[in-house]
């Protein structure tokens, strides 16, 4: 039985040109995390394999930094980065857990005026 839960940063916003940390945390399970995939819609951003380390997709290699931990840092944000991001935890023996983060990238002036999503 899958007992674990994924905690994420929920809905977040960031300034155009800035950076953001995408972070998920798996709790309430003793399952071993073998791999975490970071995906956006149909695109693979990165994979962190517990043994082999990080794989960064070439289309993101200049804008993505591994970590902290199993998280992912997105840099040089553009408005096109707005959207859903998924952390997919591959675990043994439980199987797969998926967390969702919604990122909105705002023009600097808007971000400076404090427009923020509430984290549920």
């Amino acid at each position: 039985m899958m007992t674990g839960t994924i905690e994420t940063t929920g809905n977040i916003s960031a300034e155009k040109g800035g950076s953001i940390i995408l972070q998920c945390h798996l709790s309430s399970t003793t399952a071993q995390v073998t791999q975490v995939n970071w995906e956006q819609q149909d695109q693979l951003l990165a994979i962190c394999n517990a043994d082999l380390g990080w794989h960064i997709s070439p289309s993101f290699k200049d804008r993505v930094a591994p970590g902290p931990g199993l998280g992912l840092t997105l840099q040089s944000l553009t408005v096109n980065d707005t959207g859903e991001y998924f952390c997919i935890y591959h675990t043994y023996p439980d199987g797969t857990y998926t967390g969702r983060i919604f990122l909105e990238v705002l023009e600097s002036s808007v971000a400076e005026h404090g427009a923020r999503f509430q984290i549920p």
């Epitope: 791999q35 995939n37 693979l44 994979i47 394999n49 082999l52 990080w54 794989h55 070439p58 591959h90």
Partner: antibody, heavy 119, light 107 residues
Framework: EVQLVQSGAEVKKPGASVKISCKTS????????MHWVKQAPGKGLEWIGG????????SYNQKFKGRATLTVDKSTNTAYMELSSLRSEDTAVYYC????????????WGQGTLVTVSS | DIQLTQSPSSLSASVGDRVTITCKAS??????VAWYQQKPGKAPKLLIY???YRNTGVPDRFSGSGSGTDFTFTISSLQPEDFATYYC?????????FGQGTKLEIK
Amino acid sequence: EVQLVQSGAEVKKPGASVKISCKTSGYTFTEFTMHWVKQAPGKGLEWIGGLKPDNGGISYNQKFKGRATLTVDKSTNTAYMELSSLRSEDTAVYYCARGAYYRYDADYWGQGTLVTVSS
Amino acid sequence: DIQLTQSPSSLSASVGDRVTITCKASQDVKTAVAWYQQKPGKAPKLLIYSASYRNTGVPDRFSGSGSGTDFTFTISSLQPEDFATYYCQQHYSTPFTFGQGTKLEIK
């Protein structure tokens, strides 16, 4: 120039063990994963496992777990694969292959080592 | 484990022909697919990584495309040195797996 040079061909009896070496040069050994791949005569490619030298992380294909042991010697920039309890179906060419930088595909390969298991 | 099925298994073609090989994954692997060329008695050589990126020094007659479960490898105009066996590989999850190979022969 990146180079992966493997040890020579081996002939072994069933039940024995074999240890293949892969001596590397031309890059920072600890920064790249080393994969091992099997190719039986006239057959396709089969991933045995991979090892990350900087932290010693190893991922094995379950099919080979328990019989294959991947190790490295960071002082000589050499990777090793030992295969135990050999049987006839282990007769194959074994390749070491360097994982590309921050990727899992393999961009440089050794020349291969033929292991023949025969009584 | 993720299965990769290549088609065709073998193919006869002539110099100058356009050749396409397909690779179908048993589950979604996003773009985590590489293509290798292997000549008899030699080690495989990386041609394409992450589905569509040419490796350094690979001629632009070689190309790759696809995402999800369906991938395509194309040689736009066959050269004599291209006759070899080609393999796709997924690196979305371990154990990394290869297709069974496609042998490209001279017609």
